[in-house]
Amino acid sequence: MAVTACQGLGFVVSLIGIAGIIAATCMDQWSTQDLYNNPVTAVFNYQGLWRSCVRESSGFTECRGYFTLLGLPAMLQAVRALMIVGIVLGAIGLLVSIFALKCIRIGSMEDSAKANMTLTSGIMFIVSGLCAIAGVSVFANMLVTNFWMSTANMYTGMGGMVQTVQTRYTFGAALFVGWVAGGLTLIGGVMMCIACRGLAPEETNYKAVSYHASGHSVAYKPGGFKASTGFGSNTKNKKIYDGGARTEDEVQSYPSKHDYV
């Protein structure tokens, strides 16, 4: 039961995280104009990964896409790539994890297969979360170090006198959405990996084999022989019959051909 809950919760947390990563990637407010110590606030610039916007204080807003690829900073391209990789990995992870969920039965899929799929999706979520966190952090670092600040010129006065003002940019809402979403995806992935350990059979059990005793018509059915060092006792008080131990989470299996004479 605990395994199912952990797996389900991991799936939901990852789902929310990936939705957040997608939202952050699409948002325009990755960097916003720092209005501190800037009294003439006629326009407010804010920029995303895909387009730049300007909001004029009387109410007009306009956005423009970055139509060039070659003219953009390499770091911006890297951030785009990281976010897209994160989304793709997360989406594949979600698809895999849906089939891995214990509460969903697909044909006669064994627990070992579900465990492997849970682990795979967990790893995908972890990498997806790390990609998002890395992308957002790289962008934040760019802002902090003024890596791709655009200089806005404010032309004032007569006779061509020019006053150049450096437009400073600060963290936009998308950065915080990205960090939280990446963290959630990472946590969800860890939970899936933990759930995988509970799904996988802990011990290898040999199937019981029925023997015909010579001279007797009685069939003997020994209990499941554990693969162990010989000193191990049944510490977990698991029932040992019908061909070996089963965990609580294990689905009921059909009798094997060896179970009866």
Epitope: V54, G59, T68, A152
Partner: nanobody
Framework: QVKLEESGGGLVQAGGSLRLSCAAS?????????MGWYRQPAGNQRNNQRE???????????NYADSVKGRFTISRDNAKNTVSLQMNSLKPEDTALYYC???????????????WGQGTQVTVSS
Amino acid sequence: QVKLEESGGGLVQAGGSLRLSCAASGSSNADIRFMGWYRQPAGNQRNNQREPVAMVDTTGRINYADSVKGRFTISRDNAKNTVSLQMNSLKPEDTALYYCTAVLWPRGAISAMTVWGQGTQVTVSS
């Protein structure tokens, strides 16, 4: 580089009219998106705080400040890159330094920028 040249300010009696004009020059390397007028009342000169009066975009959409609606009319000529502000029924509280402004996207720039004129004084006496 874009320069804005204003004209039309002056002294007028309350209830009177004035027309402010503004022409943009050197805009061949930039796309002017919004043009309009801001003002800076005498009390705000020190902290450089300017308030929007009226703005118009390239499609002809217009925004007016609530305080001037119904009294001021803005018009723009996109071909000539000029903007005019017809001010009617002027009140003493309209006294301010009026700035022409343009919001433009320089060619190849990632973000927009604002260009200001030098300002023209409008004084409304009671």
